[in-house]
């Protein structure tokens, strides 16, 4: 790793306030210079003396200075230095640190548990519908339909491993070919990236934090969408994934391996299984056209059952209908035959909350969906708060330098690939890309990890989840081994192909640029984040699904003009930015279009009107609800009483001037103090050394 630059004195004058604005840093440190530093060089620290944060004079930056909102905030240390503390203070500080660590791990645990329960909730609400998507016969002939089914099912069950395992079981029972399964797997890859996007929405309270978090989450979405955009047509034309994986599967004589290690589940399962337990086989059975499964509940009631294979006597219209000629008889009145049946005897009920309620799946799902989102949101707020108080000063600098600094020249290019490996390794440990990327999201939001670094970590996470699938495939029974392994390898090579497309050359790292663009839009119009989520994960897939059901002609008839318009707009946009002189004067900008077609401002007004009612009721809602409120109504005033998204950014609505909200300041303690949350004296006892 690159050596850490020597830190200058963090705060020479304790009476002066230092600026390193969160999200609006005047000057960005030069990366190339920074990476070449040696141990003895001193990092220059730009220090700007500020007025106290409650002075409104500091809230608006000079428009002349161009700020980069993507630069990481400097979380300044306001506490007493370790060396200046007495023994009692040091002990107190040590225990405070231990307490914070325990709290952090606790909230992290419940955060991961809530993600698991959120997945269960989605499966209860939409699992059966998801299963029915799979039973559509057009999947075989229409790769686009397969893709959107993959997206929709994974979004509905909140788990790519669930949708992948359904695909595997369908392939192994010859209901689906590997060729037809590949687009579904690609869709599952897209669908799984919704989880961390939902998590990013929880950080809506702070504009700059939200900008980073949302961009950091959607970088995963854009990578997946762009990969599919390029690789699906390539796969349809060449079947390269199918051919490569088939060669690999046929060249190795695999024996059934051990089960994929459940590392994180071992810790979370004891808690999550007390909340709800699901019978995941039901979704697979629906996908495989099992009529009886449609009436079964997904909520597991019996955990201990005894399965006994026995023969029962059943009546048949005539002896010609006998299952076996030798096992056929009449009692003089009815004709009988013996039928092999598996008799399941229920022994012990499951130990979870919903076992004796006998509520419909939708009701259980809705309850769990609301509760898990509340816990998820609450844990996220607390994680961000704890991390915010811990990651200050030297600790923050060390962590940020470690994570975000590149290797020294000429090995700087290797850093990203190491990050990919780290992402893959971490995902393998937690056994879920959703959990890993969701845990990454708040760290991007608070500015510990840059989007540039989060991108390879996310790509690694995509790889990590496929290695888990490969291990699971190797552990599957004989009849499913070949198909499950081939599908897992398809998933793996699809992600490898995507990385080769969108990572090695910095110019091709389009997902970062697109995610930052979306982050900027969503920071200004926060409702757009929800809009994006609905459009990309529900409306577009559902539209394609509907059009595909109507037939190829309809799909092409609607799709071709839409694609043509998109390409036209992109080409025009490219020409406008690169060589506008080639274009006629009228086409050199978008002013020839009506305002609603080229700006979100009119739409913002419409959304504001619709959410006006929320603004009225917003004031007395709790912190968590308030965040949801603010997300919808994008209101700076409405949540003043609960402080959760108090936001003095009215000026930004009127003019495009970067505005500082108290929470976006470098010093969290000061901004809290300014808002009247923490007594002024408390800022002195802030303990940051661990």
């Amino acid at each position: 790793m690159a050596p850490w630059p020597e830190l200058g004195d963090a705060q020479p004058n304790p009476d002066k306030y230092l600026e390193g604005a969160a999200g609006q840093q005047p000057t960005a440190p030069d990366k190339s210079k920074e990476t070449n530093k040696t141990d003895n060089t001193e990092a220059p620290v730009t220090k700007i003396e500020l007025l106290p944060s409650y002075s409104t004079a500091t809230l608006i930056d000079e428009p002349t200075e161009v700020d980069d909102p993507w630069n990481l905030p400097t979380l300044q240390d306001s506490g007493i230095k370790w060396s200046e503390r007495d023994t009692k203070g040091k002990i107190l500080c040590f225990f405070q640190g231990i307490g914070r660590l325990i709290l952090l791990l606790g909230f992290l645990y419940f955060f991961v548990c809530s993600l698991d329960i959120l997945s269960s909730a989605f499966q209860l609400v939409g699992g059966k519908m998801a299963g029915q998507f799979f039973s559509n016969s057009s999947i075989m002939s229409n790769p686009l339909l397969g893709l959107v089914i993959g997206v929709l099912v994974t979004v509905l069950v909140q788990s790519s491993s669930t949708s992948t395992s359904i695909v595997v079981s369908m392939v192994s029972s010859s209901l689906l070919t590997v060729r037809a399964a590949i687009p579904i797997i690609m869709g599952a890859n897209i669908g799984t990236s919704i989880t961390n996007t939902i998590v990013a929405l929880m950080q809506v309270g702070d504009r700059s934090e939200f900008r980073r978090a949302f961009a950091g989450a959607t970088v995963h979405d854009f990578f997946n969408w762009l990969s599919v955009l390029v690789l699906l047509p390539v796969e349809v034309a060449t079947h390269y994934l199918e051919i490569i994986t088939q060669l690999i599967v046929e060249s190795f004589h695999f024996k059934n391996g051990e089960d994929a290690p459940d590392l994180l589940k071992v810790i979370t399962k004891p808690f999550t299984k007390l909340i709800v337990q699901l019978d995941k086989k039901v979704i697979s059975q629906i996908a495989m056209n099992d009529e009886k499964a449609k009436n079964k509940s997904l909520v597991k009631i019996w955990c201990k059952t005894f399965t006994n294979k026995t023969q029962i006597n059943v009546t048949v219209p005539s002896t010609a209908n006998c299952t076996s000629p030798s096992l056929c008889w009449t009692d003089g009145i009815q004709n009988w035959t013996m039928k092999n049946v598996t008799y399941k005897e229920n022994i012990a009920k499951c130990q979870h909350i919903f076992v004796n309620f006998h509520l419909p799946d939708l009701a259980v799902g809705t309850i769990l969906l609301i509760l898990s989102l509340l816990v998820l949101c609450g844990c996220l707020i607390m994680i961000v708060k704890i991390l915010g108080s811990v990651l200050k000063g030297q600790v923050a600098t060390v962590i940020k330098k470690t994570i975000n600094t590149d290797f020294p020249f000429p090995f700087a290019w290797l850093t990203g690939y190491l990050a990919i490996l780290v992402g893959a390794g971490m995902t393998f440990i937690v056994q879920s890309s959703s959990v890993f990327t969701s845990a990454l999201t708040p760290l991007i939001g608070i500015g510990v990890i840059t989007i540039e670094r989060a991108y390879p970590l996310t790509l690694g996470s995509n790889i990590g989840t496929t290695t888990t699938a490969i291990l699971a495939a190797l552990a599957s029974p004989g009849n499913a081994l070949r198909s499950s392994l081939q599908i897992a390898l398809c998933h793996f090579f699809f992600n490898i192909s995507g990385i080769l497309l969108w990572y090695p050359i910095p110019f091709t790292r389009l997902p970062i640029r697109m995610a930052k663009g979306l982050g900027n839009i969503s920071a200004k119009y926060r409702w757009f984040a929800v809009f994006y989520l609905i459009i990309f994960f529900f409306l577009i897939p559902l539209t394609v699904f509907g059009l595909s059901l109507a037939g190829w002609r309809v799909l092409v008839g609607v799709g071709v003009p839409v694609v043509f318009i998109i390409i036209l707009v992109l080409c025009l946009r490219l020409l406008q930015s690169r060589c506008p002189r080639v274009l006629p004067k009228k086409l050199q900008n978008w002013n020839f279009l009506p305002l609603w077609m080229r700006s979100l401002k009119p739409w913002d007004a419409v959304v504001s009107k619709f959410t006006g009612c929320f603004q009225m009721r917003c004031c007395c809602c709790c912190r968590v609800c308030c965040r949801a409120c603010c997300l919808l109504c994008d209101c700076p005033k409405c949540c003043r009483c609960s402080k959760c998204c108090e936001d003095l950014e009215e000026a930004q609505e009127g003019q495009d001037v970067p505005v500082k909200a108290p929470e976006t300041f470098d010093n969290i303690t000061i901004s809290r103090e300014a808002q009247g949350e923490v007594p002024a004296s408390d800022s002195k006892t802030e303990c940051t050394a661990l």
């Epitope: 006597n313 000629p325 030798s326 008889w329 009449t330 003089g332 009145i333 009988w336």
Partner: antibody
Framework: QVQLVQSGAEVKKPGSSVKVSCKTS????????IHWVRQAPGQGLEWIGG????????NYKQNFRGRVTLTADKSTSTAYMELSSLRSEDTAVYYC?????????????WGQGTTVTVSS | DIQMTQSPSSLSASVGDRVTITCTAS??????VAWYQQKPGKVPKLLIY???TRHTGVPSRFSGSGSGTDFTLTISSLQPEDVATYYC?????????FGGGTKVEIK
């Protein structure tokens, strides 16, 4: 113990009817089928028909259809066989036998038999 | 209707002899065959069902075998109390039909 007790011997004129009863005990009447089998003097066994007392479903051998009626009274666990339009060749010992419903164990218990004599 | 033909119609054997009675069905009846014993002046009694399964309380010297169309009832060691007429019955299809019977006597 399992018992199937049949009514006493009957002497009937040709063209008349006879009703033989079979009172059962020692088992669940509704779980069994009651069959009727006859044996002409010095001859072999011939199946007449059977009834499921639980739902009163019956089946008869083709050459007895229209002449024989099988009934069952669940309250008294008794089965009845009525044979009409009697002919001299109907002279035989009539047996009732039980057969466990939905099972292939055949006729495992028989009544003592009722002798029906048809003579003018 | 399925015809059940028993042979011989009567046989005479000494005590302790192995006695075999055969029964031939006019068509395949699988293993849906039962054997009954009717002692003189008594009611028939079930010996074997499902071609080879001994009914409760039936001595082990009685055994049944066969499937399809050919069936046999074997008395491994004939006893004086075994003097009776033996009937085979098919219950593969309705109507239930019996064989003509085989009369077993002691020499």
């Amino acid at each position: 113990q399992v018992q199937l007790v049949q009514s006493g011997a009957e002497v009937k004129k040709p063209g008349s009817s006879v009703k033989v009863s079979c009172k059962t005990s020692g088992f669940f009447f509704t779980e069994y089928i009651i069959h009727w089998v006859r044996q002409a003097p010095g001859q072999g066994l011939e199946w007449i028909g059977g009834i499921i007392p639980n739902n009163d479903v019956t089946n008869y051998k083709q050459n007895f259809r229209g002449r024989v009626t099988l009934t069952a009274d669940k309250s008294t666990s008794t089965a009845y066989m009525e044979l009409s339009s009697l002919r001299s060749e109907d002279t035989a010992v009539y047996y009732c036998a039980r057969w466990r419903n939905a099972y292939y164990s055949a006729m495992d218990s028989w009544g003592q038999g009722t002798t029906v004599t048809v003579s003018s | 209707d399925i015809q059940m033909t028993q042979s011989p119609s009567s046989l005479s054997a000494s005590v302790g002899d192995r006695v075999t009675i055969t029964c031939t069905a006019s068509q395949d009846v699988g293993t849906a065959v039962a054997w009954y014993q009717q002692k003189p002046g008594k009611v028939p009694k079930l010996l074997i069902y499902w071609a080879s399964t001994r009914h409760t309380g039936v001595p082990s010297r009685f055994s049944g075998s066969g499937s399809g169309t050919d069936f046999t009832l074997t008395i491994s060691s004939l006893q004086p109390e075994d003097v009776a007429t033996y009937y085979c019955q098919q219950y593969r299809t309705s109507p239930l039909t019996f064989g003509g019977g085989t009369k077993v006597e002691i020499k």
